[in-house]
Every structure is written in C-alpha cells, then in structure tokens.
C-alpha cells in the first residue's frame, strides 16, 4: 500500500480468482484513543472499533472511503483504491490502446517545435467518475523539471456504439535549449482513477522524435504566363523553431485531382516555392518535415487550383 | 560561444554538401544496423544514449546560432579550446568563434572515425560476419574532415589484445551510430546556418 495523495491510498493486488488479497491496517488520524468506530462509504454498518482497523482487501467491494467516527463526529477519512496486477502486468482498463505507432500505446505526444513544449493525449470510453493527474520530467534517475498543466477533455467522438473521449495535457520543459542534443528522454506519467480503480500509464520519448510541424502558412498560387504551370509559394509556420536556416524544413508538394483514385503528382523541395502543373478541379497541398531528422510530416495545407 | 551572422562570399561553403552526405550515410548505416541486428537491443528506446565527445568537445555550444544566445538554457556550456586554422570558409573573415565551431566539428569527426575504425577491426574478426561498417560512411567522414582542413594530432587507433565480445561490440555499434546520427544532424544544421549567413 502506498499514498497517492493525502488520505488516498493505493492497494496493489495480484488479481486472480480466490486470491488472498492484501492485509491493510488503517489508523485514525486523531489524538483520541477510545470510542472510535469505523464505517465504509455511505453505509452505517460498523466494521470495527479502536484507533486502528485491520482489513483484508481482495476485491473492489473492499475498497472505498473508510471513515473513523467518535460520537457521531467524523475524525478522519482514508480512501482505498485498487491497482490490479494481472499475471505480472498492471491492468490497463481505463485507457484505450491507440495502437499507433505501435501496440500498447496509451499516451501519444507531439511537439510543434524544439522549444521543449509538447502536448500529450489519450482516449477512453469512460464518461464519469474519472480523474487524471500528469507528471513529467527529463530523465528518471536525476530528473530535471517539466511542468504540466491539468488534463482536460479535448474532444468527444462516436465510434460505432461507443462514445470515445479524448483528454489532453500541455507540458513545458523548464529549461530547454532548442539546439540541444537530447541524451535523456522526457518521461510522462499519467495517474488515472476511475471510481475505485487506480492505473498508471507512462510514455518515454525524445522531443526530436515527436516533432510534428504545423502546416506551412500563406500557401499561394501564381499562374505562369502562357503555361498550365503555376508557381506555388508558402512560408514556414509561425510555431516552427527559429532561426529557420538552422532549424530547416523540407516540403512535399502534391497535386491531387477531385477523385481520390486520380494519380497524385508529388514534388519534394527544400525551398519555399515550387512550379507545378495545375489540373482542372485539382488542389495543391503542401506539408512540412524537419529537413535533417525524419520525424512526422505536418498536416497538409491546401488551396484549390481554380 | 555562438556563430556571428557574417556575410561571406556566395557559394563559399563546400562543407554543406559533405555534411548532407554524412547525415545520409550515417542514417543509412543506422537503418542497416537496426535491421541486421534485429535480435539485439538497437532501437532508440532500448539503447543507452552515450556521447563519446562529452567533456571533450562542445559543438552544440560553440556552434550556437546568434539568435539562441539570448536563451539562458543554451549557455550552460563547457569551456573547451580548439585550434583555429580552419579553411572550410573560403573567406578570410572567418571569425574566431566560427573557427572554434568548425574545429569542434572536426574533433567530433576525428573521435568517431577512430571509434568506428577500431570497431570495424573487431567486427571483421566475428565468425558470424554479421555486420560491418559501411565504407561509404567512413569515406564521407574523411571527406568532411578534409574539407574542414584542420591540422590536428592524429589519434592512434585503439588496439585491444583481449578477445572481443562480439555481442557487446554490436551493442556499442548501435550506441555509437545513434549518437553519431544526432551529431550529424547538428553538423548539418550548423552548415546550413553558416551557408545562409
């Protein structure tokens, strides 16, 4: 058993039918010695008396808010949560496996630049009685500071019969140098509590590996005289690290017809302009990627050909 | 500790091309190592990230763009002094700081070159003959060093009398390649910045 926060405790259980569970001793936080009784949750049934209460925690029915009283007055509370270990592996019931970029990916994180700021998000089908708390650091043995905000519900979508809820959090490394070569990964730890179930999820990454630039901005077309060709131009996104000559991007320009089946023409360039043939009803899209370290491409910025 | 924004002559920067070749070569070699050594811990998540140049060179700090010198987090650097007779810039206006940066890059390349050559000698003794260093990568390191053209003492190749542990050697190869790829990215950024300056 360990303390998650004041008066909230996590009991780790080897989870299998007929498991013996864990013996837990609760102590009433009071100078009083006599006349103390214990109850669980809203029940008025007295579980025991005395300054300490010994319980065998086996299942969720044994978890909850234990309260010690004296003469009708509440003295203190202890909330017991359960953390299930199933055949040597901690349970992952609360969050959905996003399966990207690989199986058992519960937390996904992205950064728009090298400033040390990043966003993580996760998915669940649970709508109520759910709380998250996020901590982060650079490295784990001698951790350096990363400050995370509160996790917030960022999207809701319907998937088949189920509703899916997306939560996200923003974090900022306390002293980040954009040009630094990372040798210790960022660690992100999410504590999830659903009713009386506790779970924790972690992700470990280098900022360089989670970079995804914003799409190029100010995408414009300039028709070339006496030609079906157009000059496409764009600019680096505002959120990208500066100077751009040091943090350079490379670009992919795509001409896409109205039908998805039509052949796509693609051009790759390090410049912020390109000359392409504009077909009728087609659109021109441009996306960006770090020129020197192949992390994710940005989303497309698009303009119609007409 | 930073690169001043100079206005040298156009087309004066032969190192840019070499540094791009270097990044391509080390990235290809790392990919080959990951595939060939699939049953070894060779991915970024599995290896320890070691920097053989740590406390010996200070490329990131010496080559910091002027715009980032206002960022306090970028300035907690180590002090290192280098030889300053680089010829990568055709211009005579090479500042002391730029020379410091380029000589730091040269020292990095020299250190990695020695490590890779020593390692290749061990890998050639492996009866499995599973993986060797790409000669193209070694040649590209050499070309960039020549383009930087710094006079520096030659570091003798390390020789080891004891029987090599091939498993450990292959894991060390992965560690070295990951670190060298990261350094090659920094070198490419620096060359791009200098080329634009």
């Amino acid at each position: 058993i360990w303390e998650l926060k004041k008066d909230v405790y996590v009991v780790e259980l080897d989870w299998y039918p007929d498991a013996p569970g864990e013996m837990v001793v609760l102590t009433c936080d009071t100078p009083e010695e006599d006349g103390i009784t214990w109850t669980l949750d809203q029940s008025s049934e007295v579980l025991g008396s005395g300054k300490t209460l010994t319980i065998q925690v086996k299942e969720f029915g044994d978890a909850g808010q234990y309260t010690c009283h004296k003469g009708g007055e509440v003295l203190s509370h202890s909330l017991l949560l359960l953390h299930k270990k199933e055949d040597g592996i901690w349970s992952t019931d609360i969050l959905k496996d996003q399966k990207e970029p690989k199986n058992k990916t519960f937390l996904r994180c992205e950064a728009k630049n090298y400033s040390g700021r990043f966003t993580c998000w996760w998915l669940t089908t649970i709508s109520t009685d759910l709380t998250f708390s996020v901590k982060s650091s650079r490295g784990s043995s001698d951790p350096q500071g990363v400050t995370c905000g509160a996790a917030t519900l960022s999207a809701e979508r319907v998937r088949g019969d189920n509703k899916e809820y997306e939560y996200s959090v923003e974090c900022q490394e306390d002293s980040a140098c954009p040009a630094a070569e990372e040798s210790l990964p960022i660690e992100v730890m999410v504590d999830a509590v659903h009713k009386l179930k506790y779970e924790n999820y972690t992700s470990s990454f280098f900022i360089r590996d989670i970079i995804k630039p914003d799409p190029p901005k100010n995408l414009q077309l300039k028709p070339l005289k006496n030609s079906r060709q157009v000059e496409v131009s764009w600019e680096y996104p505002d959120t990208w690290s500066t100077p751009h000559s040091y943090f350079s991007l490379t670009f992919c320009v795509q001409v896409q017809g109205k039908s998805k089946r039509e052949k796509k023409d693609r051009v790759f360039t390090d410049k912020t302009s390109a000359t392409v043939i504009c077909r009728k009803n087609a659109s021109i899209s441009v996306r960006a990627q770090d020129r020197y370290y192949s992390s994710s491409w940005s989303e497309w910025a698009s303009v119609p050909c007409s | 500790r930073n690169l001043p924004v100079a206005t040298p002559d156009p087309g004066m920067f032969p190192c840019l091309h070499h540094s791009q070749n270097l990044l391509r070569a080390v990235s290809n070699m790392l990919q080959k190592a990951r595939q060939t050594l699939e049953f070894y811990p060779c991915t970024s998540e599995e290896i320890d990230h070691e920097d053989i140049t740590k406390d010996k060179t200070s490329t990131v700090e010496a080559c910091l763009p002027l715009e980032l010198t206002k960022n306090e987090s970028c300035l907690n650097s180590r002090e290192t002094s280098f030889i300053t007779n680089g010829s990568c810039l055709a211009s005579r206006k090479t500042s002391f700081m730029m020379a410091l940066c380029l000589s730091s890059i040269y020292e990095d390349l020299k250190m990695y070159q020695v490590e890779f050559k020593t390692m290749n000698a061990k890998l050639l003794m492996d009866p499995k003959r599973q993986i060797f260093l790409d000669q193209n990568m070694l040649a590209v390191i050499d070309e960039l060093m020549q383009a930087l053209n710094f006079n520096s003492e030659t570091v003798p190749q390390k020789s080891s009398l004891e029987e090599p542990d091939f498993y450990k050697t292959k894991i060390k190869l992965c560690i070295l390649l990951h670190a060298f790829r990261i350094r090659a990215v920094t070198i490419d950024r620096v060359m791009s910045y200098l080329n634009a300056s």
């Epitope: 080897d14 989870w15 299998y16 039918p17 007929d18 498991a19 299942e59 969720f60 270990k85 199933e86 055949d87 040597g88 592996i89 019931d93 690989k102 199986n103 058992k104 089908t125 | 049953f39 811990p41």
Partner: antibody, heavy 115, light 112 residues
Framework: QVQLVQSGGGVVQPGRSLRLSCAAS????????MHWVRQAPGKGLEWVAF????????YYADSVKGRFTISRDNSKNTLYLQMKSLRAEDTAVYYC????????WGQGTMVTVSS | SYVLTQPPSVSGTPGQRVTISCSGG????????VKWYQQLPGTAPKLLIY???QRPSGVPDRFSGSKSGTSASLAITGVQAEDEADYYC????????????FGTGTKVTVLG
C-alpha cells in the same frame, strides 16, 4: 472453491458451427478476464482467445480470427466460444481458463470436426 | 506458430536433477514473466510456476523456475516417477498481451 464446468463439445462436420460454454462458480466472474486454450490430439497447447472482464476487448489467435467469437454473460457467470466454418484442424480438446498469475482450468471438452 | 522453444523430450532416473529450457526473445520472455505447467495424460494443465520462479501452494519444492534474459528454465531436483508428464512454458509478447504464447512442450520420462 473456484470451478469451471465446460459443455457443448461433440462431433461436427467441416463448415458447420458449434458453441462451447464454460460455467463459472466460486468467484466473482465479472471481475476477471477469461481465455480459451485448445490441444489437438497428441499436440501441444495452443491459445485461442481472450476476453476482458467486462467484455470490452476481445483477442484471437490468427488461426481462428474471423471464424471464432469469444463472449461472456456476466449475469449468468458463463463464458462462450462460438465456432463457425469449422475445419478438420480445429479438432482438439478445448479448455476455458481464468486470467491471472494463478489460473484455474475447466475440465476440457472434445470437439471433433469430421465428415 | 510457436515462438517459445522447448526440447521435445528430456529424461532422468529417479533422484536425478532434470532441467527443461524455454527459449524466447526480447519481446516475450525478455519483457514478461514466465509460467510453467505440468500436464498428466488426459487431464487439464496444472500450474507449477508463476512469475518466473514462484511456486503456488501445494506444488512440491523440488520444482523450481528461473529466468535469464530471453530464456527460462524449469528444474526438477530429485525427479520422481509421478513427475513423468508433459511440461509447457508460457509467456506474453509485450506488444500483444494478453495474447498468450505457449512453449512447444517437453515430455519428461523417468527411467527405470
């Protein structure tokens, strides 16, 4: 005392269907994941399928994916394996078992696919 | 397809020490715990070892398990006639848990 009692096995022709049941008692069935495992005559153990405690996630071996469906009825404390498009190579003793570091196995039920 | 490899058979005389190996990879045994089962003819498998080296109550202490890197082994010190059975190791793959992997199985024969 944890008990898993299996039923539903038998002889079936190739291409036909069969449903196996596994009735659980002596524990809170709705709190635990469950597996199906099979063993062809004279062969080793082969994992078939798994279902989470609440039925929200199901996993299958590649050899049965698309043909077999694992399900559970927590109100009846029963686990099921619906087997469709049966093949000769599905002939085996099928076992249900609980998920956890200590597991409990059913007695097994024989499924024979033969024309 | 089996990813956990065991020798098809091992044998020993009563009182001898018999060991069975189970060879896997970094993503299964290297990342997860191992179980061992004993299966007597015509019966369901019985758990002998969980968590690499833990014995459930009721399992004789002549059975012991260990794990090193990507391999695991089961040892029977002082093998007895009633130990003649099939033995299976079991683990998970870190990317596909709870998909379960069983070893190929080993027939233990007690001679004479």
């Amino acid at each position: 005392q944890v008990q898993l009692v299996q039923s539903g096995g038998g002889v079936v022709q190739p291409g036909r269907s069969l449903r196996l049941s596994c009735a659980a008692s002596g524990f809170t069935f709705s709190s635990y994941g469950m597996h199906w495992v099979r063993q062809a005559p004279g062969k080793g153990l082969e994992w078939v399928a798994f279902i989470r405690y609440d039925g929200s996630n199901k996993y299958y071996a590649d050899s049965v994916k698309g043909r077999f469906t694992i399900s559970r009825d927590n109100s009846k404390n029963t686990l099921y394996l619906q087997m469709k498009s049966l093949r000769a190579e599905d002939t085996a003793v099928y076992y249900c078992k609980t998920h956890g570091s200590h597991d409990n196995w059913g007695q097994g039920t024989m499924v024979t696919v033969s024309s | 397809s089996y990813v956990l490899t065991q020798p098809p058979s091992v044998s020993g005389t009563p009182g001898q020490r018999v060991t069975i190996s189970c060879s896997g990879g970094r993503s299964n045994i290297g990342s997860n715990t191992v179980k061992w089962y004993q299966q007597l003819p015509g019966t369901a498998p019985k758990l002998l070892i969980y968590g690499n080296d833990q014995r459930p109550s009721g399992v004789p202490d002549r059975f012991s398990g260990s794990k090193s890197g990507t391999s695991a082994s089961l040892a029977i010190t002082g093998v007895q006639a009633e130990d003649e059975a099939d033995y299976y190791c079991q683990s998970y793959d870190r990317g596909t848990h709870p998909l379960t992997m069983f070893g190929t199985g080993t027939k233990v024969t007690v001679l004479g």
